[in-house]
């Protein structure tokens, strides 16, 4: 008798999910020698344990604590780059500026980046057919709770000047409902963080507007100021030139505004 399976609105678990997580863990420890104390089998077991046999709408941060413990990592707290809706450029930036880190440059972020996963209540099976959608099904699903947990911890660890890259091409440059707006902003520690510096990335070639004056940026400034953290904002008019200048800061064309 075929067992009834819950149909969720979101895509199912990424194919080769266990193999991918394990392979990513091993790769990470190979290229980050300081993390070679990590036992990747234990990491996978803890990851699996967070969602397997559990209802995929009933996941808690507590479920991920064993994984968080195994993935504990110290990154320089004054070298943190947050991002919202502009992941690729943020990653291109930290690829060049090697001393700065996005969440996906840490072990736990690297393991889960771009993956989807969920299980089923009372069975040890991974659901490759469908997983809950945050909007249409439930917010306490395995993927959303994971990113909420790691994002909160990442923001809590930040100190001094924290940078955030924001997408100037979107209608809401700062979106209160994004992970940055709903989790990270509220978990920066005012006793450690002096300034949040926003970099607003322009999309259009001829876009010379000051997007730091955008109403949503003003809203971000207000939230941050109320938390006793200073706020500053810069327009990045030419993201391509910006990256080039990070690579070659001595280039003569890099003295002008980018």
């Amino acid at each position: 008798v075929p067992r009834w399976r819950q149909q969720w609105s979101g895509p199912g678990t990424t194919k080769r999910f266990p193999e991918t997580v394990l392979a990513r863990c091993v790769k990470y420890t190979e290229i980050h020698p300081e993390m070679r104390h990590v036992d990747c089998q234990s990491v996978w077991d803890a990851f699996k344990g967070a969602f397997i046999s559990k209802h995929p709408c009933n996941i808690t941060e507590e479920d991920y604590q064993p994984l968080m413990k195994l993935g504990t990592q110290t990154v320089p707290c004054n070298k943190i780059l947050l991002w919202s809706r502009i992941k690729d450029l943020a990653h291109q930036f930290t690829q060049v500026q090697r001393d700065m880190f996005t969440l996906e440059d840490t072990l736990l972020g690297y393991l889960a980046d771009d993956l989807t996963w969920c299980g089923e209540f009372n069975t040890s099976k991974i659901n490759y057919q469908s997983c809950p959608d945050w909007r249409k099904d439930c917010s306490n699903n395995p993927v959303s709770v994971f990113w909420k947990t790691v994002s909160r911890r990442f923001a809590e660890a930040a100190c001094d000047v924290v940078h955030v890259m924001l997408n100037g091409s979107r209608s809401k440059i700062f979106d209160k409902n994004s992970t940055f707006g709903s989790v990270e902003v509220h978990n920066l520690q005012p006793e450690k963080v002096q300034t949040l510096e926003a970099w607003v990335i322009h999309g259009g070639r001829e876009d010379s507007r000051d997007l730091c004056q955008d109403p949503t940026i003003k809203e971000l400034e207000s939230i941050i100021s109320k938390r006793n953290i200073q706020f500053s904002c810069k327009n990045i008019y030419r993201p391509d030139k910006f990256l080039q200048c990070v690579k070659n800061p001595e280039d003569s064309s890099c003295t002008s505004e980018i």
Partner: antibody, heavy 123, light 112 residues
Framework: QMQLVQSGAEVKKTGSSVKVSCKAS????????MHWVRQAPGQALEWMGW????????DYAQKFQDRVTITRDRSMSTAYMELSSLRSEDTAMYYC????????????????WGQGTLVTVSS | DIVMTQTPLSSPVTLGQPASISCQSS???????????LNWLQQRPGQPPRLLIY???TRAAGVPDRFSGSGAGTDFTLKISRVEAEDVGVYYC?????????FGQGTKLEIK
């Protein structure tokens, strides 16, 4: 079985560039970091850099930082190493290499090597 | 960068006799995970290198048990209990404790 097959020998002029390919088979290409190592005639081995084929992220030895670019084509399971501004000292055998995984741990040793690509730089 | 120094640079040996190659690193290769990130590679004439030993003393797959690695911290030894004709080539030690991975200058094993 696991294989790394490299492109053929190249003769290049001083100041030009060379692009060497390394085609992987017998395993999931994106699951392993790919390294590049070179060996000048009668000299020791010299590590040049790595690429994570899944993300395309790279890291290079300081010595080659300004001249080397490692890329990959996931659909072809192939990694590439391009070296620019060639000089006579770049005449060497260029190898791609990969570690083995021992019960979910990277061994830290290059267990699999391509056959090598001889690049000769002449003026 | 960690500097790897091998001695001797050339080692003439008699078939069937033991051979020993030494390698010294400029800093300890012992990781906090308890593993020592020292490898030995063999390169036969006209061939790519072949991994013999990793983690200082673990033989790679398919490597005969006449090859053994030992050492501690910064001093390492590769021993061949009885040299065979196919062992002729250059032997390299290599550290993988940190980036960049670095190699010794090689020791040429030749038959007397």
């Amino acid at each position: 079985q696991m294989q790394l097959v490299q492109s053929g020998a190249e003769v290049k002029k001083t100041g030009s560039s060379v692009k060497v390919s390394c085609k992987a088979s017998g395993y999931t290409f994106t699951d392993y970091i790919m390294h590049w190592v070179r060996q000048a005639p009668g000299q020791a081995l010299e590590w040049m850099g790595w690429i994570d084929p899944e993300y395309g992220s790279t890291d290079y030895a300081q010595k080659f930082q300004d001249r080397v670019t490692i890329t990959r084509d996931r659909s072809m399971s192939t990694a590439y190493m391009e070296l620019s501004s060639l000089r006579s000292e770049d005449t060497a055998m260029y190898y791609c290499a990969r570690v083995a995984i021992i019960t979910t741990v990277a061994s830290g040793g290059f267990a699999y090597w391509g056959q090598g690509t001889l690049v000769t730089v002449s003026s | 960068d960690i500097v790897m120094t091998q001695t001797p640079l050339s080692s003439p040996v008699t078939l069937g006799q033991p051979a020993s190659i030494s390698c010294q690193s400029s800093e300890s290769l012992l990781h906090s995970n308890g593993k020592t990130y020292l490898n030995w590679l063999q390169q036969r004439p006209g061939q790519p290198p072949r991994l013999l030993i990793y983690w200082m003393s673990t033989r790679a797959a398919g490597v005969p048990d006449r090859f053994s690695g030992s050492g501690a911290g910064t001093d390492f030894t590769l021993k061949i209990s009885r040299v065979e004709a196919e062992d002729v080539g250059v032997y390299y030690c290599q550290q993988f404790l940190e980036y960049p991975p670095t190699f010794g200058q090689g020791t040429k094993l030749e038959i007397k």
